[in-house]
Interface confidence: low
């Protein structure tokens, strides 16, 4: 039932995050008269759409409407009816759809077209569905966490306590891990960004920011696993793959056609004398780590320094918020505590990966086996990516904060995306021209 009390002078916005493994709908709310204040927008609802990511609907686009129904109906319930028509809805698709577009632009367009038609049927102000770039994904994630942490303004914040308080306005870097890509975004210290593709310039609340960002397509946790399997099966002597990234006693049959379905495994593709192979877990962290490192080409760097695969990366600077799958995986492994050193994380991963599969299944009976089986790989991958990929050290590890929510709002790109598209981040302080969408795309 709708509340008939005096109408609050508030506004709402909806963003759908169409990721590679699933879609989530976020509803944001803010006081109408404080649109340009920093820190006033907050998340009131998250609805996870049941089913896979939208790129998986390529052969069954007619099911997309039903797929989105539950969460869109939830939005109808949460947002007062009087506000429906003026509530903007945005859908941003990320790396799963980027990969589909690489395979076929036509198929990707077809999926987006059906998504748009489905979302247009609701009484909201639908503003479009699009595939956002990796650069945007990194930039919006960086904006989200710094907005929520109150880094863009000296003014009093609407909430009482900011976690990760550092008593200064130095921004946090953003580390985002998805299923198909991973982003690193931060303000380097007095460092020229040697590659123009990785440079962003913003003016927010009267201050200029020179930001470095890069999105590594195919290096999200799910695609990294496909890459690793494709690489390792090349040298397997038969259709048995003894894999150190899965628990001892774990077994799973993989179709070779599924392995080579993604563009991410193309560089490892070869003709195999079998249609299927069986993964047999041996649960060895050190060997798993070594196997993962082979996915990072560190032998070539045309810049003063690189992350991997010849991509420029300036020296790391300041604190970082690590969110999305960085957080979910580390949370499951109970390794998000600020007290846990990198050495302790490694030690815990060694113990975890070595636990027999039957024991793990018993210990985590409520967790779906598909997800449960991959935590050893995912945790090891996170360590490998952060340490060898991005060059964090045992000492700088303490500057990584694994963040799920900040004051009730999920850390991720969606809030930054909405703030930008609704012109709620002014370039000047206190009120002036809002940041235009073209400023950093």
């Amino acid at each position: 039932t709708q509340n008939k009390a005096l109408p609050e002078n508030v506004k709402y916005g909806i963003v759908l995050d169409a990721g590679s493994s699933h879609t989530s709908l976020y509803i944001y709310k803010w006081p109408a008269e404080k649109e340009n204040d920093t820190g006033v927008v907050h998340q009131v609802e998250e609805c996870r759409v049941k089913g896979p990511g939208i790129s998986k609907f390529v052969q069954k686009v007619n099911e997309i409407g039903i797929y989105l129904t539950d969460c869109m109906e939830r939005a109808r319930e949460v947002i007062p009816r009087s506000q429906h028509q003026e509530t903007p809805v945005y859908l941003g698709a990320t790396a799963g759809m980027r990969l589909l577009r690489m395979e076929s632009e036509e198929l990707a367009d077809r999926v987006l077209d059906v998504v748009e038609r489905s979302l247009s049927n609701y009484p909201f102000d639908f503003q479009g569905a699009r595939i956002i770039t990796g650069q945007e994904e990194g930039a919006y994630g960086w904006i989200t966490i710094n907005y929520l942490l109150g880094k863009f303004s000296q003014k009093t914040r609407w909430f009482s306590i900011v976690p990760y308080e550092t008593n200064n306005q130095e921004t946090f870097g953003a580390l985002d891990l998805g299923g198909a890509s991973t982003q690193v975004t931060f303000v380097p210290q007095n460092q020229t960004i040697e590659s123009p593709d990785n440079a962003l310039q913003f003016r927010l609340y009267g201050k200029d920011y020179n930001v470095y960002t890069h999105s590594f397509l195919c290096y999200g946790k799910d695609q990294a696993l496909w890459q690793k399997l494709a690489k390792d099966i090349q040298v397997a002597s038969n259709e048995i793959l003894r894999d150190p990234c899965f628990h001892p006693g774990y077994k799973k049959v993989v179709n070779v056609s599924d392995l080579y379905k993604t563009p991410c495994t193309k560089r490892f593709e070869m003709t195999l004398p079998f249609q299927q192979f069986e993964i047999q877990g041996i649960g060895n962290y050190q060997q798993c780590h070594q196997s993962i490192l082979e996915l990072f080409n560190t032998s070539y760097c045309p810049y003063s320094q690189c992350a991997f695969n010849g991509i420029f990366l300036p020296p790391l600077q300041g604190d970082f918020g690590a969110f999305s799958a960085f957080y979910f995986v580390m949370k499951f492994l109970n390794l998000t505590s600020e007290k846990v050193s990198q050495e302790k994380v490694t030690e815990m991963m060694k113990k975890f990966c070595a636990q027999p599969w039957e024991e793990i299944k018993t210990s985590y009976a409520g967790v779906k086996e598909k997800y449960l089986s991959e935590y050893c790989f995912s945790g090891t991958y996170i360590l490998s990516l952060l340490l060898q990929g991005y060059h964090f050290t045992a000492d700088s590890w303490e500057h990584i904060h694994f963040i799920g929510k900040i004051q009730g709002s999920d850390a991720g790109w969606t809030l930054g995306y909405m703030l930008n598209l609704t012109n709620m981040i002014p370039a000047e302080q206190p009120l002036s021209t809002p940041l235009s969408h073209s400023t950093y795309v």
């Epitope: 949370k331 109970n334 007290k339 846990v340 050193s341 815990m348 018993t362 210990s363 967790v367």
Partner: antibody, heavy 119, light 109 residues
């Protein structure tokens, strides 16, 4: 090898305060949550509270909230527990203990400090 | 506070199985992890961790000790019992800060 060495036994009068120290060697106290647990003669273990020496943040059991103060000194790698308004029922052995990863192994315990409250 | 209730005492012959139970007032599971630990304490000594996370054996502890359970009901099993196992045994939750059970006194007949 990490070791926790506590201060010696104390005898106090009712109404007085006692301050017990716990010096850690072999690792920095900032790597841990430091807990205090007490045990009255012939009784069970009773958790009193913990301190996060990295940020001087404390959490106390409801029962002790108004009487206990936990502090730390990172320069000497020592944590302290002060209990005020002592009464005879506070006679107990007081232990300090580390907790590195919340919910995982409690790595180390001190040898205990006997505090006797008697008039 | 999460209240933990233990069986108070147990007498068992060497070579037999000893089963100590602990019930929690509310669940100590969180995100698939069970925050239940078991300690052994002998007179004049600090407690010694035996089992953490309900079923993981602490380093240096003999495999005769095992832990099981989830949610609100937990068991510490010693099989086979040895004379040296005479001690008090405590369950402890660390899901929400710490709380200890009242202890179970195990005597070897």
């Amino acid at each position: 090898q990490v070791q926790l060495v506590q201060s010696g036994a104390e005898v106090k009068k009712p109404g007085a305060s006692v301050k017990v120290s716990c010096k850690v060697s072999g690792d920095s106290i900032t790597a841990y949550f430091m807990h205090w647990v007490r045990q009255a003669p012939g009784k069970g273990l009773e958790w009193m509270g913990r301190i996060d020496p990295d940020h001087e943040r404390t959490k106390y059991a409801e029962k002790f909230k108004n009487r206990v103060t936990m502090t730390s000194d990172t320069s000497t790698n020592t944590v302290y527990m002060e209990l005020s308004s002592l009464r005879s029922e506070d006679t107990a052995v007081y232990y300090c203990a580390t907790e590195r990863v919340p919910g995982f192994e409690t790595d180390y315990w001190g040898q205990g400090t006997m505090v006797t409250v008697s008039s | 506070d999460i209240v933990l209730t233990q069986s108070p005492a147990l007498a068992v012959s060497p070579g037999q199985r000893a089963t100590i139970t602990c019930r929690t007032q509310q669940t100590v599971d969180h995100y698939g992890t069970t925050y239940m630990n078991w300690y052994q304490q002998k007179p004049g000594q600090p407690p010694k961790l035996l089992i953490y996370l309900a079923s993981s054996l602490a380093s240096g502890v003999p495999a005769r000790f095992s832990g099981s359970g989830s949610g609100t009901d937990f068991t510490l099993t010693i099989n086979p019992v040895e004379a040296d196992d005479t001690a008090n045994y405590y369950c402890q939750q660390s899901r929400n800060l710490w709380t200890f059970g009242g202890g179970t006194k195990v005597e070897i007949k």
